[in-house]
C-alpha cells in the first residue's frame, strides 16, 4: 500500500476563538484522505480526525487540556480507501503546522451586552461572561476564569441623537457611567487583552444596544 499520487497538505492554519480551535489546510482532497496528529513540545503525538476527507480538524478537546502549552500539529496524506496496515513501513507525506499557544493566540469572541440599568444619571452596563470549553474539575470555565485580570472590556457609548462616542474601561464585567438625564444612549463593548502585542489583542465590537429597547431598565 504505497502513497503514490498523494499530495502533502499545505497552508496549515489555526482558527481559534475563545479556545474553540480548528486546524484548517489545503488542498481539497482528490483521491486522498488525511489524518491529523497533535503534540505539545515535550509530549507524544496523538492522532485525530482519522482518514478524513475534510480539510479541517477540531482540536479543541486536546488544547483545552492545557491552554498555556504550545502545540504543534501535522497532517498526513493517504490514498483514498487507505486501511492501516501493520506491514506498511513507508511514511506518508505530511506537513507541520505553525506552533500554536492557545492562551496567547486564541481570538476573543464577540462579546454580548447582557443588560443595562439606568438609575438617575448613572447607567450600569453588564457584559455577559462567555463560557469556554476549558474545564476545571469537570466544570466549564468562563473567559474571565481563564484570563482573570488579563482581560478587560472597553465600552463605547453615545447619545442616540449624536455621533460623538465616549469610552470607559473595566477589568470586571460591569461599567458604571454617568449620563445626561432624559437622553437615550447606545452601547457597544469590546473585549481586550492589553498584554497582547498582536492583532488578536481585541475582539470585534458587540452588537449595539440602545436605551429604550428590551435589554434596558430605567428607574428614577
Amino acid at each position: 500500500s504505497g502513497t503514490t499520487n498523494t499530495v502533502a497538505a499545505y497552508n496549515l492554519t489555526w482558527k481559534s476563538t475563545n479556545f474553540k480551535t480548528i486546524l484548517e489546510w489545503e488542498p481539497k482532497p482528490i483521491n486522498q484522505v488525511y489524518t491529523v496528529q497533535i503534540s505539545t513540545k515535550s509530549g507524544d503525538w496523538k492522532s485525530k480526525c482519522f482518514y478524513t476527507a475534510d480539510t479541517e480538524c477540531d482540536l479543541t478537546d486536546e488544547i483545552v487540556k492545557d491552554v498555556k502549552q504550545t502545540y504543534l500539529a501535522r497532517v498526513f496524506s493517504y490514498p483514498a480507501g487507505h486501511v492501516e496496515s501493520t506491514g506498511s513501513t513507508e511514511e506518508p507525506p505530511y506537513e507541520n503546522s505553525p506552533e500554536f499557544t492557545p492562551y496567547l493566540e486564541t481570538n476573543l469572541g464577540q462579546p454580548t451586552i447582557q443588560s443595562f440599568e439606568q438609575v438617575g444619571t448613572k447607567v450600569n452596563v453588564t457584559v455577559q461572561d462567555e463560557w469556554t470549553l476549558v474545564r476545571r474539575n469537570d466544570t466549564f470555565l468562563s473567559l474571565r476564569d481563564v484570563f482573570g485580570k488579563d482581560l478587560i472590556y472597553t465600552l463605547y457609548y453615545w447619545k442616540s441623537s449624536s455621533s460623538g462616542k465616549k469610552t470607559a474601561k473595566t477589568n470586571t464585567n460591569e461599567f458604571l457611567i454617568d449620563v445626561d438625564k432624559g437622553e437615550n444612549y447606545c452601547f457597544s463593548v469590546q473585549a481586550v487583552i492589553p498584554s497582547r502585542r498582536t492583532a488578536n489583542r481585541k475582539s470585534t465590537d458587540s452588537p449595539v444596544e440602545c436605551m429604550g429597547h428590551e435589554k434596558g431598565e430605567s428607574r428614577e
Epitope: 476564569d145 482573570g148 470586571t172 497582547r196
Partner: antibody, heavy 120, light 113 residues
Framework: EVQLVQSGAEVKKPGESLRISCKGS????????IEWVRQMPGKGLEWMGD????????NYSPSFQGHVTISADKSISTAYLQWSSLKASDTAMYYC?????????????WGQGTLVTVSS | DIVMTQSPDSLAVSLGERATINCKSS????????????LTWYQQKPGQPPKLLIY???TRESGVPDRFSGSGSGTDFTLTISSLQAEDVAVYYC?????????FGQGTKLEIK
C-alpha cells in the same frame, strides 16, 4: 517539576546598578506571568510588578515605577529585575514568583529569593 | 490602590485549637463576571519564600492540608486553621489578586500558646 531559580546574593554600594535573574523551568515560560516581590528585613511582602514573557507586557506598582525595570528573555526562560542606581533602602530579599494556571489564582510557585544588600 | 488590612497583627493559639485570621479590603474583590472573589492567602515560614495556600478566597491549592480553609466575599475574608499544628507557626498574608497594583496585607504572625 516547576522551578524558579534566582541568582545569588549581591552586595552593592549606593548609586551602583544591578540586575538579578529568575530562571523558570518545567513549564511553558511564555504563558505565565512572572511576579517580583520585595521583603525588607523583618517586614511584610510588597508587590513590585510583573511581566508576561510571551509578549513582554509589564505592570508596575506605583511605589516602584521608574526605580526598577522588569524584563525577560524568553529564549532562555529568564526574567530580570534591574536597578540603574541603588539606594540603601533597596536592601531587601527579592522573590520572583509564577502566576497560577487559572486567572487571578495567586502566585503558585516561588523562587528561593535573592538577598540584595546596599551599603556604603 | 486597594488597601488590605489584616487582623490581628499577631495571634497565639494552643495546639489543636482553631486559629482565625481576618482580612479586609478597601474595595470589593468580587468579580461580577464569574462571581469569584480574587483574594489569595499565603503562608511564610522563617527563612523561606511564601507558599500559596488559598486562591479565589476559598479554593485550596493542591497539596494544602484541609485544616486550612478560606471564606468571605466582597471586602471581608477569613482564613481558618481548624486544628493548629506545630508546623503552622508562620506569618500569613492576604493579597488582592483582583486588580493592579496587586497588594498584600501587612501579615499576621501565628504562634503557639
Amino acid at each position: 517539576e516547576v522551578q524558579l531559580v534566582q541568582s545569588g546574593a549581591e552586595v552593592k554600594k549606593p548609586g551602583e546598578s544591578l540586575r538579578i535573574s529568575c530562571k523558570g523551568s518545567g513549564y511553558t515560560f511564555i504563558t505565565y506571568w512572572i511576579e517580583w516581590v520585595r521583603q525588607m528585613p523583618g517586614k511584610g511582602l510588597e508587590w513590585m510588578g510583573d511581566i508576561l514573557p510571551g509578549s513582554g507586557s509589564t505592570n508596575y506598582s506605583p511605589s516602584f515605577q521608574g526605580h526598577v525595570t522588569i524584563s525577560a528573555d524568553k529564549s532562555i526562560s529568564t526574567a530580570y529585575l534591574q536597578w540603574s542606581s541603588l539606594k540603601a533602602s533597596d536592601t531587601a530579599m527579592y522573590y520572583c514568583a509564577r502566576s497560577g494556571y487559572y486567572g487571578n489564582s495567586g502566585f503558585a510557585y516561588w523562587g528561593q529569593g535573592t538577598l540584595v544588600t546596599v551599603s556604603s | 490602590d486597594i488597601v488590605m488590612t489584616q487582623s490581628p497583627d499577631s495571634l497565639a493559639v494552643s495546639l489543636g485549637e482553631r486559629a482565625t485570621i481576618n482580612c479586609k479590603s478597601s474595595q470589593s474583590l468580587l468579580s461580577s463576571g464569574n462571581q469569584k472573589n480574587y483574594l489569595t492567602w499565603y503562608q511564610q515560614k522563617p527563612g523561606q519564600p511564601p507558599k500559596l495556600l488559598i486562591y479565589w478566597a476559598s479554593t485550596r491549592e493542591s497539596g494544602v492540608p484541609d485544616r486550612f480553609s478560606g471564606s468571605g466575599s466582597g471586602t471581608d475574608f477569613t482564613l481558618t486553621i481548624s486544628s493548629l499544628q506545630a508546623e503552622d507557626v508562620a506569618v500569613y498574608y492576604c493579597q488582592n489578586d483582583y486588580t493592579y497594583p496587586l497588594t498584600f496585607g501587612q501579615g499576621t504572625k501565628l504562634e503557639i500558646k
